[in-house]
Interface confidence: medium
C-alpha cells in the first residue's frame, strides 16, 4: 500500500494549527470499516491518534488533534494538530492498513517570530564622546534559536565585543539578549538584527546615541519607536519605561494606558494599586517590575481589533507621556492550487489555476511565476475577504493556455511578517488528472 | 474645601443633545477621575462613565457609549458630559462625582435634564 | 452587569434604636487588587448622594462612629447602631469592582 506524505517539514507556528498530510488510494469498493490508520510520533511510537473499524478512536495527544472523517473515504489520512507547541516538533508517522500495510513519516518543524527587540542603553544619561556604554538588544518568545547581528549606521558589521546569551522558557520559547559594548563617538548609530532561521524574519531595532544632556523637567517616558508588531492570538508587550528618581515609591506614581485616538482607558495604576484592565480583561501591568520604571503594558491574545496607537501616560511629581503603535499580523497558510478543468488536458487547452491561502492579516501581496521565475501578470484576479476576526481569505486566479507542460507558482506575501507561503502546481501537456491536495 | 458645582437646570426636546458643565474647586482637577451619574425621578442611581482629567482617558457604561461623550477642559477646570438624541426616559438629575478610578467622594449638586416635545 | 439588591425596601426606625440594611451582590466584589469596592451612599431629601463607607467597613472622613459596614464576597451590611432624625433619606450601596459600576435600588429610611 503505497502512502504519501510531504518530503519537505511542514512548518507551523506555536499556537497556530498544522496540518500533517497523509494520503493512500483507495480501490474501487473501499469501505472504512476496513480501514485501519494510526498516527503516532516516530521516534517514541507514542500513539497520537487512530482510526479503525469504522471510527474515530480519537486523540491520545493532548486532545489536540483531529483527523478529516469527510475525506477519510477519498484516501485522506492528514492529521491536524491544533495550538502547536514547540514540544510537538519532530516527525510523526502515518500508517495505513486495508488488506496490506504501509507507512511514511512526515516531520513537523515549529517556528515562532521573534518580537520586535528592544534596546537599552546602560549608562543612559549625562553621555559624552569617549564614554563606554552597553547597548543591550532584547528579543523575545522566538523558535527556534535566532542569529544575532550588529551594525553600525554605515551598515558595516560589529563583531567585537558583543556577548549573546538564548535562554528558553516554560514553553521552549527563545528569550535572546545580545549585549554590544562600545565607545561613544560625537554620536552613532546602533542597530541589532535577530533573525529567525526556520522564516527567515528579520526583526531590527535601532538606537541613535547624541551624547549630551536629556532634557530635565517633566518626566521623560521612553516607548519603542518603531511599530510592535504582534501575531493574533499571541501576548503583546507594549513597552513603556520611565526613569524614576532616588527614593522614588510606587505610591506617588499615577500611570494610565489609553487608545490614543479615542482616549479610551485601558489600565491604570494609581494610590500604589493596580486597578485593573478597563480593556476587555485583556491586559496587565509587570508590577514587580513598576518600582524600576518599567511602566509596560501586557495585551493578551491580541485580535486585529487592537492595532492601533496606545498612550502611556506616567505622572509622578510632572506629567510625561509617549505613544507606542501596535501592528497585527496573522501569517498566511501554504497556498492550495486547485485546477479547472483538471482532467485529460492537452496542449492549447485555457486552464483556470486558483491559488487560495486562509486566515492571514494584513492584506497580503500575491505573485505568479512561471517555471523559469518569470512574473505572470496577465489574466490574473485576487480577490481578498476579511472574516469575522478581520482575517484575510485570499483567492488568486490564473489564465492560462497550457505549452507542452509547465509550473505555475503562486507566492502570497504578508507585507509586515515579511512572511512568503507558496504553492506550485506542474502541468504534463499530456492526457493527466490533477491529484488531489492533501 | 472640595466643591463640584454643576450648571443649571435644562429642558430638551427628544432628539437633541445636552451639555452639563461641573466645575471642580478645591484640589488638583488633572489627578482625580471624574464620574458621571444619573437618577431618574424617584428611581435609583445609574453610572454613565468615568473620564481622567490629565490623559483624558475614558470608560463607559455600555447603555451610556454610543451616547455619551465626557470630556475636560483642565485650564477652567471643568468636566462635561453631553449626551445626544435625548427621548424621554433620559429625564434624570445628572451628577458628577470626583475621585479614584473605582470610587468617587465628592458628589455635585445635580442638573436636572427634562427632556420633553 | 453586576445586580446590586437591598433588603428591605423601606425601614421605618425608632429614634435610639438600632438598624441594619442588607446588600447582596450577584458576584463576587473581591477586585483583581484583593480589595473589594463596596460603597454605602445616604442621599438625604433634596440634596446629592452622600459618602458614608468605602471599601465594604471604611469610615468616610466626617461620618460619625454609629455607622459601620460588614461583609464580604457578596453579602453586606449596613448598621447604624442608634439612629437620630437626621439619619433619614433613602441608603445605596454600591460596587465599582466590575465596569459598568452599579448601585442598590435604595433603602428608605424614616422615623416611625
Known amino acids: 500500500l503505497e502512502v504519501q506524505v510531504p518530503e519537505d517539514p511542514v512548518v507551523a507556528l506555536v499556537g497556530t494549527d498544522a496540518t500533517l498530510c497523509c494520503s493512500f488510494s483507495p480501490e474501487p469498493g473501499f469501505s472504512l470499516a476496513q480501514l485501519n490508520l494510526i498516527w503516532q510520533l516516530t521516534d517514541t511510537k507514542q500513539l497520537v491518534h487512530s482510526f479503525a473499524e469504522g471510527q474515530d478512536q480519537g486523540s491520545a495527544y493532548a486532545n489536540r488533534t483531529a483527523l478529516f472523517p469527510d475525506l477519510l473515504a477519498q484516501g485522506n489520512a492528514s492529521l491536524r494538530l491544533q495550538r502547536v507547541r514547540v514540544a510537538d516538533e519532530g516527525s510523526f508517522t502515518c500508517f495505513v492498513s486495508i488488506r496490506d500495510f504501509g507507512s511514511a513519516a512526515v516531520s513537523l518543524q515549529v517556528a515562532a517570530p521573534y518580537s520586535k527587540p528592544s534596546m537599552t542603553l546602560e549608562p543612559n544619561k549625562d553621555l559624552r564622546p569617549g564614554d563606554t556604554v552597553t547597548i543591550t538588544c532584547s528579543s523575545y518568545q522566538g523558535y527556534p534559536e535566532a542569529e544575532v547581528f550588529w551594525q553600525d549606521g554605515q551598515g558595516v558589521p560589529l563583531t567585537g565585543n558583543v556577548t549573546t546569551s538564548q535562554m528558553a522558557n516554560e514553553q521552549g520559547l527563545f528569550d535572546v539578549h545580545s549585549i554590544l559594548r562600545v565607545v561613544l563617538g560625537a554620536n552613532g548609530t546602533y542597530s541589532c538584527l535577530v533573525r529567525n532561521p526556520v522564516l527567515q524574519q528579520d526583526a531590527h531595532s535601532s538606537v541613535t546615541i547624541t551624547p549630551q544632556r536629556s532634557p530635565t523637567g517633566a518626566v521623560e517616558v521612553q516607548v519603542p519607536e518603531d511599530p510592535v508588531v504582534a501575531l493574533v492570538g499571541t501576548d503583546a508587550t507594549l513597552r513603556c519605561s520611565f526613569s524614576p528618581e532616588p527614593g522614588f515609591s510606587l505610591a506617588q506614581l499615577n500611570l494610565i494606558w489609553q487608545l490614543t485616538d479615542t482616549k479610551q482607558l485601558v489600565h491604570s495604576f494609581t494610590e500604589g494599586r493596580d486597578q485593573g484592565s478597563a480593556y476587555a480583561n485583556r491586559t496587565a501591568l509587570f508590577p514587580d517590575l513598576l518600582a524600576q520604571g518599567n511602566a509596560s503594558l501586557r495585551l493578551q491574545r491580541v485580535r486585529v481589533a487592537d492595532e492601533g496607537s496606545f498612550t502611556c501616560f506616567v505622572s509622578i511629581r510632572d506629567f510625561g507621556s509617549a505613544a507606542v503603535s501596535l501592528q497585527v499580523a496573522a501569517p498566511y497558510s501554504k497556498p492550495s492550487m486547485t485546477l479547472e478543468p483538471n482532467k485529460d488536458l492537452r496542449p492549447g487547452d485555457t486552464v483556470t489555476i486558483t491559488c487560495s491561502s486562509y486566515r492571514g492579516y494584513p492584506e497580503a501581496e500575491v505573485f505568479w511565476q512561471d517555471g523559469q521565475g518569470v512574473p505572470l501578470t496577465g489574466n490574473v484576479t485576487t480577490s481578498q475577504m476579511a472574516n469575522e476576526q478581520g482575517l484575510f481569505d485570499v483567492h488568486s486566479v490564473l489564465r492560462v493556455v497550457l505549452g507542452a507542460n509547465g509550473t505555475y507558482s503562486c507566492l502570497v506575501r504578508n507585507p509586515v511578517l515579511q512572511q512568503d507561503a507558496h504553492g506550485s502546481v506542474t502541468i504534463t501537456g499530456q492526457p493527466m488528472t490533477f491529484p488531489p491536495e492533501a | 474645601e472640595v466643591q463640584l458645582v454643576q450648571s443649571g437646570a435644562e429642558v430638551k426636546k427628544p432628539g437633541s443633545s445636552v451639555k452639563v458643565s461641573c466645575k471642580a474647586s478645591?484640589?488638583?482637577?488633572?489627578?482625580?477621575?471624574m464620574h458621571w451619574v444619573r437618577q431618574a425621578p424617584g428611581q435609583g442611581l445609574e453610572w454613565i462613565g468615568l473620564?481622567?482629567?490629565?490623559?483624558?482617558?475614558?470608560n463607559y457604561n455600555e447603555m451610556f457609549k454610543n451616547r455619551a461623550t465626557l470630556t475636560v477642559d483642565r485650564s477652567t477646570s471643568t468636566a462635561y458630559m453631553e449626551l445626544s438624541s435625548l427621548r424621554s426616559e433620559d429625564t434624570a438629575v445628572y451628577y458628577c462625582?470626583?475621585?479614584?478610578?473605582?470610587?468617587?467622594?465628592?458628589w455635585g449638586q445635580g442638573t436636572t435634564v427634562t427632556v420633553s416635545s | 452587569d453586576i445586580v446590586m439588591t437591598q433588603s428591605p425596601l423601606s425601614l421605618p426606625v425608632t429614634p435610639g434604636e438600632p438598624a441594619s440594611i442588607s446588600c447582596r451582590s450577584s458576584?463576587?466584589?473581591?477586585?483583581?487588587?484583593?480589595?473589594?469596592?463596596l460603597r454605602w451612599y445616604l442621599q438625604k431629601p433634596g440634596q446629592s448622594p452622600q459618602l458614608l463607607i468605602y471599601k465594604v467597613s471604611n469610615r468616610f472622613s466626617g461620618v460619625p462612629d454609629r455607622f459601620s459596614g460588614s461583609g464580604s464576597g457578596t453579602d453586606f451590611t449596613l448598621k447604624i447602631s442608634r439612629v437620630e432624625a437626621e439619619d433619614v433619606g433613602v441608603y445605596y450601596c454600591s460596587q465599582s469592582t466590575h465596569v459598568p459600576y452599579t448601585f442598590g435600588g435604595g433603602t428608605k429610611v424614616e422615623i416611625k
Open positions: 473620564i481622567h482629567p490629565w490623559s483624558g482617558s475614558t
Open positions: 478645591g484640589y488638583t482637577f488633572s489627578s482625580y477621575w
Open positions: 458576584q463576587s466584589l473581591v477586585h483583581s487588587n484583593q480589595d473589594t469596592y
Open positions: 462625582a470626583g475621585g479614584g478610578r473605582l470610587y468617587f467622594d465628592y
